[in-house]
Interface confidence: low
């Protein structure tokens, strides 16, 4: 009798009620291997799931997540809400990364900025909520006369007088200062609704929010359940 069942191909099941005849899988069920005594119910992609591949008599349906969600788990067993870059998903929804952390993806958690000094390097570009810091040469590499192995400075090319160099340096400083002022001004205006959270954040002071904002900071404090941000 077992031999009869082993002849049943994928897409069928060995029907004990019909003298071990191979019966096709009923609608919305499948068998992906031969010799099965039952067909498995097809996976249904409902709610936050959407169908990536329809179920057939020989293979299960495959699901994806609808827009605004991403798959978690093997075979997309769970859909998790997307957040913006610079945020992480908490029990209360999407929350901004705490100062000193970043998330460059729409999923996952905020991770601490790289500590450049651990590798003996200096910070070349400051970190943001969305981006890690960029580490540059070590401070020792930048300071003059730090290494006796430093090659001698090349002779100055004609035309590069000290006056021109001074003028260029001064111009650059003024331009950078103006840029910094504009960025700061823009930042203050943009974030006034957020109570200047990242500019004037005080340790362990919870920002007062008149409304529950979706993207308020997820800085969790010691008394909160989920473990605190180290400020």
């Amino acid at each position: 009798l077992q031999d009869l069942c082993s002849n049943c191909p994928a897409g069928t099941f060995c029907d004990n009620n019909r003298s071990q005849i191979c019966s096709p899988c009923p609608p919305n069920s499948f068998s992906s291997a031969g010799g099965q005594r039952t067909c498995d119910i097809c996976r249904q992609c409902k709610g936050v799931f959407k169908t990536r591949k329809e179920c057939s008599s020989t293979s299960n349906a495959e699901c994806d997540c609808i827009s605004g969600y991403h798959c978690l788990g093997a075979e997309c067993s769970m859909c998790e809400q997307d957040c913006k870059q610079g945020q992480e998903l908490t029990k209360k929804g999407c929350k901004d990364c705490c100062f000193g952390t970043f998330n460059d993806q729409k999923r996952g958690i905020c991770r601490p900025w790289t500590n450049c000094s651990l590798d003996g390097k200096s910070v070349l570009v400051n970190g943001t909520k969305e981006r890690d810091v960029v580490c540059g040469p070590s401070p020792a590499d930048l300071s003059p006369g730090a290494s006796s192995a430093t090659p001698p400075a090349p002779a100055r090319e004609p035309g590069h007088s000290p006056q021109i160099i001074f003028f260029l340096a001064l111009t650059s400083t003024v331009v950078l200062f103006l840029l910094f002022f504009l960025v700061l001004r823009f930042s203050v205006v943009k974030r006034s609704r957020k109570k200047l959270l990242y500019i004037f954040k005080q340790p362990f002071m919870r920002p007062v929010q008149t409304t529950q904002e979706e993207d308020g900071c997820s800085c969790r404090f010691p008394e909160e359940e989920e473990g605190g941000c180290e400020l």
């Epitope: 068998s31 992906s32 291997a33 099965q36 498995d40 996976r43 249904q44 409902k46 799931f49 293979s59 299960n60 495959e62 699901c63 978690l72 788990g73 093997a74 075979e75 997309c76 067993s77 769970m78 999923r107 996952g108 958690i109 991770r111 989920e226 473990g227």
Partner: antibody, heavy 125, light 109 residues
């Protein structure tokens, strides 16, 4: 009854190759992702590799990436682990394990609920 | 990669006593993705708890799991002789790699 039976282990020299097999029965094999987990003598468990039910997605631990290849033949209900460029530190008992809940709507990782008895791989000159 | 640290390394207790095993994650893990296993010498691991607190099929109710975020606990309310073994926690969160804790050995005092 769900059963997983590993084979293919043995003694191999450093730099050599070996292919492990895991024969599955008692469940719809293609509906489950499968994993290989190893345990060096007297040590803890280390996840090695995993493969989705369809075989379309594979995952590896950094320690074996580029050397090991996981695959499956759903028509034969068999999981494989091809191990190349073997090193002494790959010496371990290798287990295959059924990895995830087949009830796909579940929002919960169901753990590795069934394991084989393991097969010993010894890499030594 | 998320690192799981189990404590204590060894727990010496007598049958009938309560065992509390700790598992701490290096970063927050969804409780849906934490499992506990028991392993006896010469045997394959056996799933005890999944989803941090759900008992696997056939596991006695003296085993219970709890915790969230970075701290998880496996409790054996009254140790039976067959419970003396090594216990591992395991996480699967934000895709692979899956990682295991280094294990806690529960031995007879």
């Amino acid at each position: 009854e769900v059963q997983l039976l590993e084979s293919g282990g043995g003694l191999v020299q450093p730099g050599g190759s070996l292919r492990l097999n895991c024969a599955a029965s008692g469940f719809t094999f293609s509906s489950y992702a499968m994993s290989w987990v190893r345990q060096a003598p007297g040590k803890g468990l280390e996840w090695v590799s995993a493969i989705s039910g369809s075989g379309g997605s594979t995952y590896y631990a950094d320690s074996v990436k580029g050397r090991f290849t996981i695959s499956r033949d759903n028509s034969k209900n068999t999981l494989y682990l091809q191990m190349n460029s073997l090193r002494a530190e790959d010496t371990a008992v290798y287990y295959c394990a059924r990895s995830y809940d087949k009830y796909w709507g579940s929002s919960m990782y169901s753990g590795m609920d069934y394991w084989g008895q393991g097969t010993l791989v010894t890499v030594s000159s | 990669e998320i690192v799981l640290t189990q404590s204590p390394g060894t727990l010496s207790l007598s049958p009938g006593e309560r065992a509390t095993l700790s598992c701490r994650a290096s970063q927050s893990v969804s409780s849906s993705y934490l499992a506990w296993y028991q392993q006896k010498p010469g045997q394959a691991p056996r799933l005890l708890i999944y989803g941090a607190s759900s008992r696997a099929t056939g596991i006695p109710d003296r085993f219970s799991g709890s915790g969230s975020g970075t701290d998880f606990t496996l409790t054996i309310s009254r140790l039976e002789p067959e419970d003396f073994a090594v216990y591992y926690c395991q996480q699967y969160y934000s895709y692979y790699p899956v990682t295991f804790g280094q294990g806690t050995k529960v031995e007879i005092k």
